[in-house]
Interface confidence: medium
């Protein structure tokens, strides 16, 4: 059969907001397969670290990402 | 909106250890990054340590290596800083700070609410 | 570490004067630097962040610019409660470091 795709999950939301500065790019995690839904961010030093999509800071940090770099986002 | 009350001033003997306090109100402590400054009387502003919120963990100025410890009662949404080998020269103002959460871009490292400062005195 | 120097040390103004405080950092540090003022017996209060963003609720006479290196905070007509010790911070590397200050008294 065809080749199953991983699916990445988050399993814990980081409370604390993540300064801009340090912010590289972002994905949601939407997948059913998924306790949460989520969004990870990836850092310029290549980290990911997953967020709660209900808090400001997020969809703050999502909208300065998407008007930095105006890629549609899966 | 976030508020942040401090201990009372302490007076030790040199050697002795510290500890200040840092209540969180109006939002969670897991919710912010918390430093703490110092300020020697007639100095200027020292800063000594803080929550990275990207690594996780606490970075501290090399200066306060092994001598300081930041920690943090998430029961209490309270904040600590505890420093020990106290001499004569850690005679200062002691402040915690951290974001107001309100600033619109969340470019800047939270030093933006502060408590009222605690004064430590190192006296034999 | 980076090390972060303001000019003057100190100065005396009056009111109504241009006042132009100017910090250095000994490396680049984009524009990850605030201000901030200081009054006798009270707890710092940021005016600037991000070089040149004024925090909410600090009047409109307050500004800054710069990038890289070399930073400014201007008071384009100094009021009587603006006379206090100003103070620079770079939160680009750690140990995130103060400038050394500067006074601001009446001439």
């Known amino acids: 059969g065809p080749a199953s795709v991983p699916t990445t999950c988050c399993f814990n939301l980081a409370n604390r907001k993540i300064p801009l500065q340090r912010l590289e790019s972002y994905r949601r995690i939407t997948s059913g397969k998924c306790p949460q839904k989520a969004v990870i961010f990836k850092t310029k030093l290549a980290k990911d670290i997953c967020a709660d999509p209900k808090k400001k800071w997020v969809q703050d940090s999502m909208k300065y990402l998407d008007q930095k770099s105006p890629t549609p986002k899966p | 909106q976030v508020q942040l009350v401090q201990s009372g001033a302490e007076v030790k003997k040199p050697g002795a250890s510290v500890k200040v306090s840092c209540k969180v109100s109006g939002y969670t402590l897991t919710e912010l990054s918390m430093h703490w400054v110092r300020q020697a009387p007639g100095k200027g502003l020292e800063w000594m340590g803080g929550?990275?919120?990207?690594?996780?963990?606490?970075i501290y100025a090399q200066k306060f290596q092994g001598r300081v410890m930041m920690t943090e009662d998430t029961s209490t949404d309270t904040a600590f800083m505890d420093l020990s080998s106290l001499r004569s020269e850690d005679t200062a103002v002691y402040y915690c700070?951290?974001?107001?959460?309100?600033?619109?871009?969340?470019?800047?490292?939270?030093?933006?609410?502060w408590g009222q400062g605690t004064t430590v005195t190192v006296s034999s | 570490d980076i090390q972060m120097t303001q000019s003057p040390s100190s100065l005396s103004a009056s009111v109504g004067d241009r006042v132009t405080i100017t910090c250095r950092a000994s490396?680049?540090?984009?524009?990850?630097l605030g201000w901030y003022q200081q009054k006798p017996g009270k707890a710092p209060k940021r005016l600037i962040y991000?070089?040149?963003s004024l925090q909410s609720g600090v009047p409109s006479r307050f500004s800054g610019s710069g990038s890289g290196t070399e930073f400014t905070l201007t008071i384009s007509s100094l009021q009587p409660e603006d006379f206090a010790t100003y103070y620079c911070?770079?939160?680009?590397?750690?140990?995130?470091?103060f400038g050394p200050g500067t006074k601001v008294d009446i001439k």
């Open positions: 911070l770079q939160h680009n590397t750690y140990p995130f470091t």
């Open positions: 700070a951290t974001d107001d959460m309100l600033t619109p871009h969340y470019l800047y490292f939270g030093m933006d609410v």
């Open positions: 991000a070089t040149s």
């Open positions: 929550f990275d919120p990207e690594d996780g963990e606490t």
């Open positions: 490396q680049g540090i984009r524009n990850d």
